[in-house]
């Protein structure tokens, strides 16, 4: 089942997911000055069953110069287009998603396609969070989001991370303020505040967290 | 929570225009496309054509370039269309969607008379 | 453009029975179709997108299946809120078209 919105937004990150469940969708979007062909799909599917999945549909992006189509739109700032959810500063390391039943890998790119991936998450994924380059995490808790179905609606959870600036100066746990979940309370209420300057150990915790949820994922 | 708030309903004179709009919340606006759909008693659900936001592009289906026009207002998360020369075949309720199908508005009612 | 029908305009079932829409596409269309269910003076509501991968919130008694030309949406285990118009559609090809519809009548 398809989640009704997208993983939260999170100041200063990035989310990524190791693998797609099936049913997701990535939508063909185009790099500027490219478009969809009209004929081409909408989006890539994740599709299959419990022992293979792929991809299916291929996305086609044509110059848009070549079509008649007028821009009535008003344009967005690229500053603005800060969080890429598929582009990782230091790419964390993945799993074998060939051993994750039901699962896609991550699709590989398509002639001129832009350069932010749109993906629909179903029921069940998760995505991991990550501070972009020239800022450091705060840890209260996983950087990392679910996407849970409860009373027959979807809802993210809320990844306990804070990306600062390094020129900043952290606060100390003390004096921290807690990170809400939509519920207005921390979802890890025992969860203690972990400050890590190293890049590479975030990584690495974050891959080694990773295999750990998909396997528990199907317990 | 991801939503598609359409304009309120039109009472219009034939041979005028009308424009209405849809606006988005809940979603990265300039993210997905937004279509727009008629649906008029007896003639089913037509594909107007949609516009990407944040691409700048448009797309009309052929039988109804000319009638309609598609924009987006990226400042303000919203899309319009706009119906022109209106007669009574235009009289129906519109749909803006988006999400890949999965959000409808609530509709718009269009009624041309004189 | 792709045409799509529905061929059956009305279907009557009862509460507990199990009951198929059929759709076909006038060309091939892969997996790129959408079911939808329309209540009376409600807005479509998207059920299944992809020929049978079902949207959030809507009950498994819901299935969609086919491919290529052929599509079904079987109901199983009708409820009576189930009374609704249900018209598929394909985005495969553009323009996008829509079936006619088939309304579900509870007995």
């Known amino acids: 089942e398809l989640c009704d919105d997208d993983p939260p937004e999170i100041p200063h990150a990035t989310f990524k997911a190791m693998a797609y469940k099936e049913g997701t969708m990535l939508n063909c979007e185009c790099k500027r000055g490219f478009r969809r062909i009209k004929s081409g799909s909408l989006y890539m599917l994740c599709t299959g069953n419990s022992s293979h999945s792929s991809w299916d549909n291929q996305c086609q992006c044509t110059s848009s110069a070549t079509r008649n189509t007028t821009k009535q739109v008003t344009p967005q700032p690229e500053e603005q287009k800060e969080r890429k959810t598929t582009e990782m500063q230091s790419p964390m390391q993945p799993v074998d998603q060939a051993s994750l039943p039901g699962h896609c890998r991550e699709p590989p790119p398509w002639e001129n396609e832009a350069t932010e991936r749109i993906y629909h998450f179903v029921v069940g994924q998760m995505v991991y969070y990550q501070c972009v380059q020239g800022y450091r995490a705060l840890h209260r808790g996983p950087a990392e989001s679910v996407c849970k179905m409860t009373h027959g609606k979807t809802r993210w959870t809320q990844p306990q991370l804070i990306c600062t600036g390094e020129m900043e100066t952290s606060q100390f746990p003390g004096e921290e303020k807690p990170q809400a979940s939509p519920e207005g309370r921390p979802e890890s209420e025992t969860s203690c505040l972990v400050t890590t300057t190293d890049f590479q150990i975030q990584t690495e915790m974050a891959a080694t967290m990773e295999t750990s949820i998909f396997t528990t994922e199907y317990q | 929570q991801v939503q598609l708030q359409q304009s309120g309903a039109e009472l219009v004179r034939p041979g005028t225009s009308v424009k209405m709009s849809c606006k988005a919340a809940g979603y990265t606006f300039t993210n997905y496309w937004i279509g727009w759909v008629k649906q008029r008693p007896g003639h089913g659900l037509e594909w107007i054509g949609d516009i990407h936001p944040g691409g700048g592009y448009i797309d009309y289906n052929e039988k109804f370039t000319g009638k309609a026009t598609l924009t987006a207002d990226t400042s303000s998360s919203t899309a319009y269309m706009q119906l022109s020369s209106l007669t009574s075949e235009d009289s129906a309720i519109y749909y803006c969607v988006s999400r890949n199908f999965a959000k409808w508005g609530q509709g718009t009612l269009v009624t041309v008379s004189a | 453009d792709t045409t799509v029908t529905q061929s059956q305009k009305f279907m009557s079932t009862s509460v507990g029975d199990r009951v198929s829409v059929t759709c076909k596409a006038s060309?091939?269309?892969?997996?790129?179709v959408a079911w939808y269910q329309q209540k009376p003076g409600q807005s479509p509501k998207a059920l299944i997108y992809?020929?049978?991968y079902r949207y959030s919130g809507v009950p498994d008694r819901f299935t969609g299946s086919g491919s290529g030309t052929d599509f079904t949406l079987t109901i199983s285990n009708v409820q009576s809120e189930d009374l609704a118009e249900y018209f598929c559609?394909?985005?495969?090809?553009?323009?996008?078209?829509f079936g006619g519809g088939t309304k579900l009548e509870i007995k």
């Open positions: 992809s020929a049978s």
């Open positions: 559609q394909q985005y495969n090809s553009y323009p996008y078209t």
């Open positions: 060309q091939n269309v892969g997996t790129n």
